[in-house]
């Protein structure tokens, strides 16, 4: 797996360098989970062909993953900070069952799978601290995500893959809206 | 990185259109996103849109908004800024640049990749 943002060798070899800011360490964090993502999604595209599917055929699923709309304020038209700032952290609540899900599913990329779901806690954490209005992010019930997990995992082997691929494109998309989101903030 | 060479600039009369093209052979072009700066002479480099991987996510300078059209056809490599309604302010030499992270940004340090740039001159 990756070495975590803050710890590869150009930071130790440059110890009197500027600390990061809490904006440029966010942005260095969905970077790092970015590259996470594309290195899971070799495994899954080398595994199966999924990743040939056409996105409308793939858009055919019962799955509740978060995406971005114009309502949550994170597009220039409509833009407002607080609310996509909310909106961001609540959907990466929401992915972190996704998340679980994904952590057997990579035989060489196990490591990988564990560093994107770690990354994403420590994600999580850092815009709470920048969130003002914590109220109104709404933290997704245990109980309804344990049996979503049930229900995820008893699934047959090929709809287990098509939803490996499903949340690993759809956690991307998020992401990088979410990033373009913040770099304006 | 991926190499991008930007065309379609030229002289234009006040009140009319261009369309510039920002081309690669990079075949894993359709996963970046594209940014277009321009630098007018004596003047700093600035951001005018930006398209994600997903199409729909498009930003623009506030300057531009309502003037300028950025799209892609990955079919083609390709990035498109449809620019309209030009007026001499306009005039500047245009970049291309693309992120590999495919989010893009109002910065230059968020892209890793720029072309030469190609020039757009406004006037009577």
């Known amino acids: 797996a990756p070495v975590p943002p803050g710890e590869d060798s150009k930071d130790v070899a440059a110890p009197h360098r500027q600390p990061l800011t809490s904006s440029e360490r966010i942005d260095k964090q969905i970077r790092y989970i970015l590259d996470g993502i594309s290195a899971l999604r070799k495994e899954t595209c080398n595994k199966s062909n999924m990743c040939e599917s056409s996105k409308e055929a793939l858009a055919e699923n019962n799955l509740n993953l978060p995406k971005m709309a114009e309502k949550d304020g994170c597009f220039q038209s409509g833009f407002n900070e607080e609310t996509c700032l909310v909106k961001i952290i609540t959907g990466l609540l929401e992915f972190e069952v996704y998340l679980e899900y994904l952590q057997n599913r990579f035989e060489s990329s196990e490591e990988q799978a564990r560093a994107v779901q770690m990354s994403t806690k420590v994600l999580i954490q850092f815009l709470q601290k920048k969130a003002k209005n914590l109220d109104a992010i709404t933290t997704p019930d245990p109980t309804t995500n344990a049996s979503l997990l049930t229900k995820l995992q008893a699934q047959n082997q090929w709809l287990q893959d098509m939803t490996t691929h499903l949340i690993l494109r759809s956690f991307k998309e998020f992401l990088q809206s979410s990033l373009r989101a913040l770099r304006q903030m | 990185e991926v190499q991008l060479v930007e065309s379609g600039g030229g002289w234009v009369q006040p009140g009319g259109s261009l369309k510039l093209s920002c081309t690669t052979s990079?075949?894993?072009?359709?996963?970046?996103?594209v940014g277009w700066f321009r630098q007018a002479p004596g003047k700093e480099r600035e951001f005018v849109a930006d398209?994600?991987?997903?199409?729909?996510?498009?930003w623009y300078a506030h300057s531009v908004l309502g003037r300028f059209t950025i799209s892609r056809d990955d079919a083609k490599n390709t990035v498109y800024l449809q620019m309209d309604s030009l007026k001499p302010e306009d005039t500047a030499v245009y970049y291309c640049a693309a992120d590999k992270y495919g989010v893009g940004g109002n910065a230059q340090g968020y892209y890793d990749s720029w072309g030469q740039g190609t020039q757009v001159t406004v006037s009577s």
């Open positions: 990079g075949r894993r072009f359709s996963e970046y996103a």
């Open positions: 398209i994600g991987e997903q199409a729909e996510n498009t």
